[in-house]
């Protein structure tokens, strides 16, 4: 079986301030088992945006039901966008591990640009 790939089909997304951004992400395989996390930015300074496993992320909703066993769509929506939300968002697949999950593969990233709300 081919190794899992994380696909972020949109290189960039432009959203008006106050609107909802949809960031698309799909995996090509169910293997390895483990959660998806979304980050803004890369490297040690990256911001955790959504963790499938734990935490409370009130501005984020998933497009699909991530609890379904065969789900491979990890797209998210972020509500009430502000200029501080601008940046590149990465969908990252983790492999289940003990005690901690291990980062397995990242998508190429989607750049979110925020347009000022027309006055």
């Amino acid at each position: 079986e081919e190794e899992l790939q994380v696909i972020q089909p949109d290189k960039s997304v432009l959203v008006a301030a106050g609107e909802t951004a949809t960031l698309r992400c799909t995996a090509t395989s169910l293997i390895p088992v483990g959660p998806i996390q979304w980050f803004r930015g890369a490297g040690p300074g990256r911001e955790l945006i959504y963790n499938q496993k734990e935490g409370h992320f009130p501005r984020v909703t998933t497009v699909s039901d991530l609890t379904k066993r065969n789900n491979m769509d990890f797209s998210i929506r972020i509500g009430n966008i502000t200029p501080a939300d601008a940046g590149t968002y990465y969908c990252v697949k983790f492999r289940k591990g003990s005690p901690d999950d291990v980062e397995f593969k990242s998508g190429a990233g989607t750049e979110l640009s925020v347009r000022a709300k027309p006055s």
């Epitope: 990256r46 935490g55 501005r59 501080a84 939300d85």
Partner: antibody
Framework: VQLVESGGGVVRPGESLRLSCAAS????????MNWVRQAPGEGLEWVSR????????DYAESVKGRFTISRDNSENTLYLQMNSLRAEDTAVYYC????????????WGLGALVTVSS | ETVLTQSPATLSVSPGERATLSCRAS??????LAWHQQKPGQAPRLLIY???RRATGIPDRFSGSGSGTDFTLTISSLQTEDSAVYYC??????????FGGGTKVEIK
């Protein structure tokens, strides 16, 4: 949610102090955390922020280069290392949980008093 | 850098009366404004976020309104325990996070 600061005290100008904030009741490693201070009889002043993973930090201009924020997600603890302390750093220091990565502060600790005096 | 200006600095209101507090931003902050209450000798407590949403456990006599640059916190029927300093906080542009200078609410 509970945030408990410790490590406050009285120091002389130029000395150092490290504040700790023990967090419980939520998934600490998923949230950005902040330090906010309040000088006697004054308003609230944001001091520093650290992202959920600990690799991203921001500081107020007034403390940049002197204060260092850090966190230990395995111990659910937030820190503020304060060096080269000045009289104007005298304040109650609060740790505050951020609602999400880009948001307001939804829970506050009780505060730790830092007094810088010769 | 966004500056938040609160008015009045002090507000004296009789129990049961309405208290209206204002927070004005130097540039638009959309609806990204929170209100915190700080009673004497205590830590701040979140009251309102996203301009008008009440935080968990906050009585419905507290309400927030506004968007853009002008915001209002209203206490519909003031209770003695509402005596406190109230701060607004913007989180549209950061860092730095900014707080207003505060409004002290006193009971007449």
């Amino acid at each position: 949610v509970q945030l408990v600061e410790s490590g406050g005290g009285v120091v002389r100008p130029g000395e150092s102090l490290r504040l700790s904030c023990a967090a419980s009741g939520f998934s600490f490693s998923s949230y950005a955390m902040n330090w906010v201070r309040q000088a006697p009889g004054e308003g609230l002043e944001w001091v520093s922020r650290i992202n959920s993973g600990g690799g991203g930090t921001d500081y107020a201009e007034s403390v940049k280069g002197r204060f260092t924020i850090s966190r230990d997600n395995s111990e659910n603890t937030l820190y503020l290392q304060m060096n080269s302390l000045r009289a104007e750093d005298t304040a109650v220091y609060y740790c505050a949980k951020q609602y999400d990565w880009n948001g307001f502060f939804d829970y506050w600790g009780l505060g730790a008093l830092v007094t810088v005096s010769s | 850098e966004t500056v938040l200006t609160q008015s009045p600095a002090t507000l004296s209101v009789s129990p049961g009366e309405r208290a209206t507090l204002s927070c004005r931003a130097s540039q638009t902050v959309g609806s990204k404004l929170a209100w915190h209450q700080q009673k004497p000798g205590q830590a701040p407590r979140l009251l309102i976020y996203d301009a008008s949403r009440r935080a968990t456990g906050i009585p419905d006599r507290f309400s927030g309104s506004g968007s853009g640059t002008d915001f209002t916190l209203t206490i519909s029927s003031l209770q003695t325990e509402d005596s406190a300093v109230y701060y607004c906080q913007q989180y549209y542009y950061w860092p730095p996070y900014r707080f207003g200078g505060g409004t002290k609410v006193e009971i007449k």
